[in-house]
């Protein structure tokens, strides 16, 4: 097989015919050294998935449920290209499965037992698989057959296509459970009508159903959505209140050696030449031979799936939970309202050791999961492999964009006992130089810079945001002659000053000696001209406070702060000489785990927090000899957020705006994936 050939998998005679036509038409418009199409015919989508995994084919387009099958071992396929619907300006690649109720009813998601339910149809995504999968562990046992358990959970339902003889309650609201539009309550509009008519109390539909059926906003305002956190939101807020986000139709390929760039090149060219309204002789999104062949007829084009987005992230935690529950039929032994152990995400082995020690001391209430970078940890929390971690504000922003929520803030200045209920204003992001140098904020060009890590607040977002507004481009590696900004491209000049050791050189974790606040300051001490850190960094690492060989003889007066007005001040004056105020680090979690994480952490800090005085013979949560492992070492307590419980409210408008502006220069693959 030539390496430029994409072997497309077809699942019927009609698809094979269209595939051959696709192949021939692409040949006529692409250069001979460009991508080409070959067609492989299989009996089913599952056979196609197996063929791709076995390297007998390269690509196939699948519905969400099959994307799940494709991702499971041993297939290990990943999404590479998404079909989009709607307009090019506002492309829709996902829909949201929602639970719609009337505004004048008063129950929540956890109070659905005994209500009447309206479904689009048996076995359908939004109408059955997702809601029943998410409710699975609340269904009465035995949960098999599933239809019987559902019939015993609701007090009456309309489930089109269900067996009305065996499960009459499922057809109580639509006698016969007709499986076509002859049943007035069939499909999306039907399920909504079932709610609207008062037959049912809740309808499980798509987010767009309510807009398609009620053009008038006043009418829509009579309805609300049930959210998974047992609150309600308006029907407009489906992005923040849904059961799951479901990808519509997706091209999958092998995770390793999957030709994803070639597949994208092919499909991008295909949509240019044969997309909507492009050509008379061949149309990608329709066919005389049948409906939805190779691609959905309703598709308007393709979008490349960001490389960081694996199948878990693409399908989303809620969707995978629902489908896994339905497929595997397993439920935790503990009642669902009881908090299970919290899985903390630790960065590399230093944090893992501290986390293990915490786990032992917590009697197993804390468990540990590891990842090599902060972004990998955030991804693990998103997909349920981990539950929580404490993050710098820059990563609180990324985590927030990825659907996580802040749970508790690290406080640094408030003495106990008021600490837990105090909202601090934040810390100062500062630029530190050696007293002996003649540097100012205005003559940093060409100098050697030291950063905590790319994407972090004091070390990157604030100084680079200010720099961007001065130089109007993102080539920061050209502005400084060299530097250490862990997380930069390995061949960048901003990795040149990093110390490693070798395989970990410039990695954004503690294996890189110049990572974090202490690391960036060490970089300044040993190699750099300026370090971008928090205002407490110099005092915390001078005067013998850091016993490490490189720091034990350092004096505070040998360092100064750069002020934005071009002057310099003592490190004792950060309030009058800083780059910006930074939001405190905060613990983040998935919404569904936030309450448990908060309760457990408040309990843990009472045992292992700053009230413990002897950390040499007791476990201390906020101590790691200046290494800031799991939490900043200067944390006094973890504090409740009260109403600052979203990433926007927690970080504040000004900081969010600054980071959003810097997104033009974003090097965050995770952020790109989460905003897809």
């Amino acid at each position: 097989v030539p390496e430029k050939s994409v072997r497309w998998c077809a699942v019927s005679e009609h698809e094979a015919t269209k595939c051959q036509s696709f192949r021939d038409h692409m040949k006529s418009v692409l250069p001979s050294n460009g991508p080409s199409v070959a067609c492989v015919k299989k009996a089913s989508h599952l056979d196609c998935i197996r063929a791709i995994a076995a390297n007998e084919a390269d690509a196939v387009t699948l519905d969400a449920g099959l994307v799940y099958d494709a991702y499971l071992a041993p297939n290990n396929l990943k999404p590479v290209v998404a079909e989009f619907y709607g307009s090019k300006e506002d492309p829709q690649t996902f829909y949201y499965a929602v639970a719609v109720v009337k505004k004048d009813s008063d129950f929540q998601m956890n109070q659905l037992r005994g209500r009447k339910s309206c479904h689009t149809g048996l076995g359908r995504s939004a109408g059955w698989n997702i809601p029943i999968g998410l409710l699975y562990c609340d269904l009465p046992e035995p949960r098999k057959p599933l239809e019987k358990a559902v019939a015993n959970f609701f007090s009456g339902s309309c489930v089109p296509c269900a067996d009305g003889t065996d499960f009459p309650q499922l057809c109580q609201l639509c006698p016969g459970c007709g499986c076509s539009t002859l049943n007035q309550y069939f499909s999306y509009s039907g399920a909504f009508k079932c709610l609207k008519d008062g037959a049912g109390d809740v309808a499980f539909v798509k987010h767009s159903t309510i807009f398609e059926n009620l053009a008038n906003k006043a009418d829509r305002d009579q309805y609300e959505l049930l959210c998974l956190d047992n609150t309600r939101k308006s029907v407009d807020e489906y992005k923040d209140c849904h059961l799951a986000r479901v990808p519509s139709h997706t091209v999958v390929a092998r995770s390793v050696g999957g030709k994803e760039d070639l597949i994208w090149e092919l499909l991008n060219q295909a949509q240019e030449h044969f997309g909507k309204d492009k050509s008379k002789e061949f149309q990608l999104f329709s066919s005389p031979h049948g409906k939805d062949l190779l691609f959905k007829d309703s598709a308007h084009g393709f979008l490349k799936v960001p490389p960081r987005m694996d199948a878990k992230m693409y399908l989303g935690y809620e969707y995978i939970t629902a489908i896994r529950n339905l497929r595997e039929g397993t439920c935790p032994e503990a009642p669902t309202d009881e908090c299970k152990p919290v899985k903390w995400c630790a960065l590399s082995h230093h944090e893992r050791l501290k986390c293990d020690e915490w786990s032992v001391n917590s009697a197993g209430k804390i468990e540990c999961e590891s990842a090599e970078t902060t972004e990998d940890c955030i991804a693990k929390i998103m997909n349920g492999e981990a539950d929580a971690m404490s993050l710098d504000g820059g990563f609180v922003y990324i985590a927030g964009m990825c659907g996580l929520v802040p749970v508790l803030a690290e406080n640094y200045n408030t003495p106990n006992p008021n600490c837990e209920n105090t909202a601090e204003e934040g810390y100062f992001a500062v630029a530190v130089v050696k007293s002996s140098s003649d540097l100012t904020w205005d003559n940093l060009k060409g100098k050697k810079s030291c950063h905590t890590a790319v994407g972090r607040t004091a070390g990157w977002n604030i100084p680079m945001g200010l720099l961007y507004s001065k130089i109007n481009h993102c080539r920061f590696d050209e502005f400084f002659s060299e530097g250490c900004a862990p997380g930069s491209e390995k061949n960048s000049s901003l990795c040149k000053l990093c110390m490693g050791p070798s395989p970990n050189l410039c990695e954004p974790n503690n294996k890189e000696g110049y990572y974090g606040y202490t690391g960036a300051f060490r970089c300044l001490v040993e190699k750099g001209d300026v370090a971008f850190v928090k205002h407490q960094t110099v005092p915390q690492n001078t005067g013998g406070k850091n016993p490490d060989a490189w720091a034990k003889n350092l004096k505070e007066e040998d360092y100064e702060l750069l002020c934005l007005d071009g002057s310099r001040k003592s490190v004792q004056e950060p309030a009058n000489c800083h780059l910006a105020r930074a939001p405190n680090h905060a613990v983040v979690a998935r919404k569904d785990k936030a309450d448990c994480v908060q309760t457990l952490l408040l309990d843990q800090q009472r045992m292992f927090g700053s009230s413990v005085t002897d950390c040499s013979s007791n476990f201390c949560l906020f101590e790691s000899k200046t290494k800031d492992l799991l939490f900043r070492d200067d944390t006094v307590c973890l504090a409740k957020l009260h109403d600052r419980n979203t990433y926007e409210k927690y970080l504040g408008e000004e900081y969010v705006k600054a980071v959003t502006n810097l997104r033009k220069c974003s090097t965050s693959p995770l952020l790109e994936a989460c905003t897809f």
Epitope: H349, K354, F619
Partner: nanobody
Framework: EVQLVECGGGLVQPGGSLRLSCAAS????????MAWYRQAPGKQRELVAG???????NYRDSVKGRFTISRDNAKNTMYLQMNSLKPEDTAVYYC???????????WGQGTQVTVSS
């Protein structure tokens, strides 16, 4: 800094038992937490069991009910009693006192445990 030496490993049949010891060169009385880790070929090192200064213990799920961790502060020694051993328990076992956790990645030689028929 306390130096730790592990011993007691060996070859044992499935279902058999072994007792590992971890001897400290200095006093372990004031050490907050001690633990046993293991590393199988090609796998990450993983926490097996831990014990706090007050004697409360914690185990990874796969060894609960089979392994028992204990410490004797007077003898400056920690133990791991391993019963009903399985082939998947085969690994090099290491002890740690966590005291050097923030400075370097120090591990002793470990002791090899092989469970095979």
């Amino acid at each position: 800094e306390v130096q730790l030496v592990e011993c007691g490993g060996g070859l044992v049949q499935p279902g058999g038992s072994l007792r590992l010891s971890c001897a400290a060169s200095g006093s372990i009385f004031s050490i907050a937490t001690m633990a046993w880790y293991r590393q199988a070929p090609g796998k990450q090192r993983e926490l097996v069991a831990g014990i706090t200064r007050s004697g409360s213990t914690n185990y990874r799920d796969s060894v609960k009910g089979r392994f028992t961790i204990s410490r004797d502060n007077a003898k400056n020694t920690m133990y791991l009693q391993m019963n009903s051993l399985k082939p998947e328990d085969t690994a090099v076992y290491y002890c740690t006192d966590y005291s050097s956790r923030y400075y370097h990645d120090y591990w002793g030689q470990g002791t090899q445990v092989t469970v095979s028929s």
